[in-house]
């Protein structure tokens, strides 16, 4: 496979990763598909430094990240370990709140207006951030 050595047009490079910041909204799963069609994934926050970088670019707007607990435990979309990794939840979050009246709890994580994280209904149409790593060999499948 080929390697990605520079970021695509309209993406922002930071610490050997490329980031794309949406300016419109989608449900979490649709945002996830959008990123995957860009050979990327919803942003995975692994440090306070990365948190501040993303926060600076998104501003005070609810924005999806690549963290969810739709199958039970919290998981990052790229397989980064949740339990030992960086976290930045708001106080008393995540709470899997059922009181919103939309059915079910809250299974998808987003940046809130102050940058800290909250879990929310995955169908809400929030903005999102895609991330892809530089120098990562593509998983281009061989042709039959």
């Amino acid at each position: 496979g080929s390697e990605r050595t520079c970021c695509p047009v309209n993406w922002v490079e930071h610490e050997r990763s490329c980031y794309w910041f949406s300016r419109s909204g989608k449900a979490w799963a649709d945002a996830d598909n959008y990123c995957r069609l860009e050979d990327a994934h919803l942003v995975v926050v692994t440090s306070w430094e990365e948190q501040k970088f993303v926060q600076h670019h998104i501003g005070p707007v609810n924005t999806w990240m690549g963290l969810h607990d739709q199958n039970g435990p919290w998981k990052w979309v790229d397989g980064t370990d949740y339990e030992t990794g960086f976290k930045n939840w708001r106080p008393e979050q995540p709470d899997d709140w059922y009181g919103h009246g939309l059915g079910g709890g809250e299974d998808c994580a987003h940046f809130t207006d102050d940058g800290r994280w909250n879990d929310d209904v995955c169908q809400r149409p929030y903005r999102w951030v895609c991330e892809t790593e530089l120098d990562k060999a593509s998983q281009e499948p061989p042709l039959l």
Epitope: G1, S2, R4, P8, V9, N10, W20, S24, K26, A27, A29, D30, N33, Y34, C35, R36, L37, E38, D39, P125, C130, S138, Q139, E140, P141
Partner: antibody, heavy 120, light 107 residues
């Protein structure tokens, strides 16, 4: 100038197979997701399948899942659709289409289409 | 899947007429909507994306509007080359789906 040229259509019996190709030029092929969209006679457009620019992620309509396979060869600037277990309802003009704005899947350029007829 | 319903299915109009086509979605699209023009034997053409953004090279007589689940394509003054079939498409959720089309015919 962006150009997309489909080929490989034709008459095939039910249960048969066909491979469509789409030769692309005029843009950096590997940077864009691509899709196949079809139009059956007298019907509307139907999205069939999509593939990311580097080929790592693919998506299919339920109507073709398990029967069709989308792939691409970025060294040849070519998109493919392998169609197996064809049915009469797969009869359509098949278009390849370029994603215009990232993974948004608004299609800013299309080919002129290739006709697939499934009949005994 | 999101169902897209266009109306009318066909419209007869004359050169210079104002033509409006409506597209309704079975759920909200968060403004992820496009319009295409189809002519027999030719490549489909993107006219409008993100509800109201005009694709480069498309004449300004084409315009799009709407929000939520109801959208319209307007041709302000129909030209001879505009006689064609028009389809809306939602790009909000996979699978991406299209309206069944509206044929604009010469009166």
């Amino acid at each position: 100038e962006v150009q997309l040229l489909e080929s490989g259509g034709g008459l095939v019996q039910p249960g048969g197979s066909l491979r469509l190709s789409c030769a692309a030029s005029g843009f950096t092929f590997s940077s864009y997701a691509m899709s196949w969209v079809r139009q059956a006679p007298g019907k509307g457009l139907e999205w069939v399948s999509a593939i990311s620019g580097r080929g790592g992620n693919t998506y299919y309509a339920d109507s073709v899942k398990g029967r069709f396979t989308i792939s691409r060869d970025n060294s040849k600037n070519t998109l493919y659709l392998q169609m197996n277990s064809l049915r009469a309802e797969d009869t359509a003009v098949y278009y390849c289409a370029k994603d215009g704005f990232g993974g948004s899947s608004y299609f800013d350029y299309w080919g002129q289409g290739t006709l697939v007829t499934v009949s005994s | 899947d999101i169902q897209m319903t266009q109306s009318p299915s066909s419209v007869s109009a004359s050169v210079g007429d104002r033509v409006t086509i409506t597209c309704r979605a079975s759920q909200g699209l968060n403004n992820w909507l496009a319009w295409y023009q189809l002519k027999p034997g030719k490549a489909p053409k993107l006219l409008i994306y993100a509800v109201s953004s005009l694709q480069s090279g498309v004449p300004s007589r084409f315009s799009g509007s709407g929000s939520g689940s109801e959208f319209t394509l307007t041709i302000s003054s129909l030209q001879p080359e505009d006689f064609a079939t028009y389809h809306c498409q939602q790009a909000n959720s996979l699978p991406w789906t299209f309206g069944q089309g509206t044929k604009v015919e010469i009166k």
